[in-house]
């Protein structure tokens, strides 16, 4: 069966610093979502081969990819509190399957110390709420992305 | 190919419901946003929505909030689109649009149904 | 009323340019990409320009989309008699949380 391998289980990062999220698959996909769990899941990003990836506005001009959607590192730029939470992928096939998903921690500097991962995974049951809206930074830099993507930083 | 095939033309009368439906083929259905925009006759095209097929989400133009419901059954690729309350102003053609881009939600079209004409009258 | 505002008509002779104008805000041409759609008559729209200034392939070149503060245009060059059809701008509102569309143009080759 089709299984997602989505590292790290948990990371604690300062305010503005960037976090890796790379998920793993055995191939067969149609493509693959990055998701924010929560009581209301938001889908962060759309990635496809040969497809311009979508992202989540909250993310303009944020986040990179690199790798294939069979081997997908997503890199967010510019952690703000607001993006503390719970981001699982998602691989589209005929069944979806889900990865065990990534606690990302964004803490203010001086509080680093009390606020750290445990080396379990996250659990499902257990998932801080989908951030309220927060600042974009205009995305009009402006021309398009190569089709194929480039694995650089959205405008 | 990319095909979005809507469901045909329908007569109602004020105050009842319409449901038109949008099948879309030749991609990943739940990886692109569906759009609903209507078009009444003789005027400019309308905004009323979008589903994000994927999990189901949706946002609706205020105009059409309460009134508006959109639907999706993956297991067919298919978007529906519900209109309660129906007024003869309603009396438009409604398109599905399959939305890319560089951002979710964004107004960027590259496949449009064939159209389905709704119209309300007694 | 459209969020959007552009002329309801434009004209010009076959081998002309004609320019049509897209006038927003800074809550959505101001900070956001602009899409230009070709609507002929009796069928579904068809997209035209997207990022702004992007030509999808199988646009002739002919057709070019700029974008300049709030505001947005699209120039149609060498005017020819199947350009004859409505032109739609639009964007996506930060305010609205929501696409926008222009009323429409109505291009009319003399």
């Known amino acids: 069966a089709q299984e997602v391998q989505q590292s790290p289980h948990c990371t604690t990062v300062p305010v503005g610093a960037s976090v890796n999220i790379t998920c793993s698959t055995s191939g067969g996909l149609r493509g693959i979502y990055l998701r924010q769990l929560g009581p209301q899941p938001q889908d962060i990003i759309y990635y496809e081969d040969g497809v311009v990836p979508t992202t989540d506005r909250r993310f303009r001009g944020r986040i990179d990819f690199s790798g294939s959607q069979d081997n997908l590192t997503i890199t967010m730029h510019r952690l703000q509190l607001s993006d503390t939470g719970t981001y699982t992928c998602q691989a589209i096939t005929e069944v979806n399957v889900y990865g065990s998903g990534t606690l990302v921690l964004v803490t203010e500097e001086q509080s680093q110390g009390w606020h750290r991962c445990s080396d379990a995974p996250p659990r499902a049951s257990a998932l801080p709420a989908p951030p309220t809206g927060s600042a974009l930074p205009d995305p009009q830099t402006a021309s398009a992305l190569p089709d194929p993507p480039a694995a650089s930083a959205l405008p | 190919e990319v095909q979005l095939v809507e469901s045909g033309a329908e007569v109602k009368k004020p105050g009842a419901s319409v449901k038109v439906s949008c099948k879309a083929s030749?991609?990943?259905?739940?990886?692109?946003?569906m759009h609903w925009v209507r078009q009444a006759p003789g005027q400019g095209l309308e905004w009323m929505g979008w589903?994000?097929?994927?999990?189901?989400?949706?946002n609706y133009a205020q105009k059409f909030q309460g009134r508006v419901t959109m639907t999706r059954d993956t297991s067919i690729s298919t978007a529906y689109m519900e209109l309660s309350r129906l007024r003869s102003d309603d009396t438009a053609v409604y398109y599905c649009?399959?939305?890319?881009?560089?951002?979710?939600?964004?107004?960027?079209?590259?496949?449009w149904g064939q159209g389905t004409l709704v119209t309300v009258s007694s | 009323q459209s969020v959007l505002t552009q002329p309801p008509s434009a004209s010009g002779a076959p081998g002309e340019r004609v320019t049509i104008s897209c006038s927003g805000s800074?809550?959505?041409?101001?900070?956001?990409?602009v899409y230009w759609y070709q609507q002929l008559p009796g069928t579904a729209p068809k997209l035209l320009i997207y990022?702004?200034?992007q030509r999808p392939s199988g646009v002739p070149d002919r057709f070019s989309g700029s974008k300049s503060g709030a505001s947005a245009s699209l120039a149609i060059s060498g005017l020819r008699s199947e350009d004859e059809a409505d032109y739609y701008c639009?964007?996506?509102?930060?305010?609205?949380?929501?696409?926008?569309f222009g009323g429409g143009t109505k291009v009319t080759v003399l």
């Open positions: 649009a399959r939305g890319v881009g560089l951002w979710f939600g964004e107004p960027y079209f590259d496949y």
């Open positions: 030749g991609y990943t259905f739940t990886g692109y946003y």
């Open positions: 589903i994000n097929p994927n999990s189901g989400g949706t």
């Open positions: 800074s809550s959505n041409i101001g900070s956001n990409y």
């Open positions: 990022n702004s200034n």
């Open positions: 639009a964007a996506w509102d930060d305010s609205l949380s929501g696409p926008v």
